[in-house]
Interface confidence: medium
Amino acid sequence: CRTSECCFQDPPYPDADSGSASGPRDLRCYRISSDRYECSWQYEGPTAGVSHFLRCCLSSGRCCYFAAGSATRLQFSDQAGVSVLYTVTLWVESWARNQTEKSPEVTLQLYNSVKYEPPLGDIKVSKLAGQLRMEWETPDNQVGAEVQFRHRTPSSPWKLGDCGPQDDDTESCLCPLEMNVAQEFQLRRRQLGSQGSSWSKWSSPVCVPPENPPQPQVRFSVEQLGQDGRRRLTLKEQPTQLELPEGCQGLAPGTEVTYRLQLHMLSCPCKAKATRTLHLGKMPYLSGAAYNVAVISSNQFGPGLNQTWHIPADTHTEPVALNISVGTNGTTMYWPARAQSMTYCIEWQPVGQDGGLATCSLTAPQDPDPAGMATYSWSRESGAMGQEKCYYITIFASAHPEKLTLWSTVLSTYHFGGNASAAGTPHHVSVKNHSLDSVSVDWAPSLLSTCPGVLKEYVVRCRDEDSKQVSEHPVQPTETQVTLSGLRAGVAYTVQVRADTAWLRGVWSQPQRFSIEVQVSD
């Protein structure tokens, strides 16, 4: 037999299918020009020493073969002895290691069998009613096709699916969408309505993420507040990457999960901007304020569930003695200025109340005064810190208040609001005899004592009503009792107590009269 002809003799090997898993498959035959034809196939398994034979049976029942050698592609003309206008059955037999392996048969009319391309170029992927929709441009001059898809996950083998007939310039397919695992899809096409026409090869992989992006398993840590009033947020554990099917490993456009950091500054609610979204790789510096930080994962189908961490406020090591002056027309606070042209946010919150009840005020950008201080003033009418109770004050500073990550903490401290000197007046002052010339004076703690660092001392004043002599006794802020000695029997005295802060003298309590009884000896 001539090599260019189909040989109508018995092939040069025994006729027995070994039934092994390896062997020839995916046979495709089609016309490639007006008088030339091509068949190609895949061979699975070791290729050394394998000889391929393309078998053909005509409708008359006569069969022939082409010897292809080690090649998996063979061309022949319409003069090769194979009927191209009538239906023929073709298959491949591969002779290897003393056994024959057979491919599945294809039955077709060669003249009408056109080589179809798989979807080429850009395959657009979208979500439609819980399913996956793929869409692509029909290859040139190939309108009218049957389309199949196959898909697999990292842990499952290929599954075949049908897209149905297509008859337009664009073709599409609805496929199953997995909730939590990535999938690899491939598509193939064949001529519509041409009985037994060959399938195209499979398209390049289309990699599809799960409908829900994976929840990020990350851990954060935050450094302590530095001298500059800022601290760094760091990522301790990177998000785990999505497991991908075999054909999507390496470069897998479409399955990317992007992680973003959403920062919400809870403190200083009167500032212009409370939230900022950053790339997860770009870890910010924060002030000592309280923040919520969420990690948002998203893929081409949109955002997934996020996880929110709470970053508590970082208090300064010691409450700063905030300089406060109270005048008739209002109150002014002074603190060491940070730099030129700084905006300050002053936040105050009644101690013991919920964090959501903080109030704040934003200053206009200000330069330090000649003494290097920044100031904030408010009038009594404004109602700011007007109630006679303990407040926790925090001051933040920024040269760019519109940028959330450029705030720093200046100080945090306690302050007793309202008319502190009157509100702090000790009550229930009582005098008890202690000895022949001394008494014990005690009183209920001043309201100022509920505010850390505010009460500087108590002062006890004793007045001799005869001589009008006055003595004053400072008492530690933790004490609410003092012994007055060196008193004279029979003399009338009055005693008063006041509570002082660092910047205010308190108001004396109501005078309490007492005298030591004159002892009469028997």
């Epitope: 954060f220 840590s221 935050v222 302590q224 507040l225 601290r231 947020l233 809870l266 403190s267 000592g288 309280a290 930080v293 996880q307 929110t308 961490w309 709470h310 970053i311 508590p312 406020a313 970082d314 208090t315 300064h316 090591t317 010691e318 919150q349 013991g352 919920d354 964090g355 959501g356 903080a358 926790y392 925090t394």
Partner: nanobody
């Protein structure tokens, strides 16, 4: 969401001692400043002790020298050691993640003879 759970309350005689603990759980980053507060019937909630992020402590004068706040960083737990208890210390003691809306349910402390 952050949860705070207090324990250790009870009844004690004047001059006695109690140790309260408060465990914070949830997605908390870093060492939180935490405070103990108390509320007696008909009175406002008042600060008892606070421990800052760096371990600094603050007390109102009414408890200074008698109460001590401490923390265990490994598990975000804060303790309040209360000595020389007085009848006026009777209240429900609450733990708070400083400056936030996160509060514990509270634990009752009763000081009476």
């Amino acid at each position: 969401e952050v949860q705070l759970v207090e324990s250790g309350g009870g009844s004690v005689q004047p001059g006695g001692s109690l140790r309260l603990s408060c465990a914070a759980s949830g997605l908390i980053v870093g060492r939180p400043a935490m405070g103990w507060y108390r509320q007696a019937p008909g009175k406002q909630r008042e600060l008892v002790a606070i421990i800052g992020s760096g371990g600094n402590t603050n007390y109102p004068e009414s408890v200074k020298g008698r109460f001590t706040i401490a923390r265990e960083n490994a598990n975000n737990t804060v303790y309040l050691q209360m000595n020389s208890l007085k009848p006026e210390d009777t209240a429900v003691y609450h733990c708070n993640l400083h400056g936030t809306r996160f509060w514990g349910q509270g634990t009752q402390v009763t000081v009476s003879s």
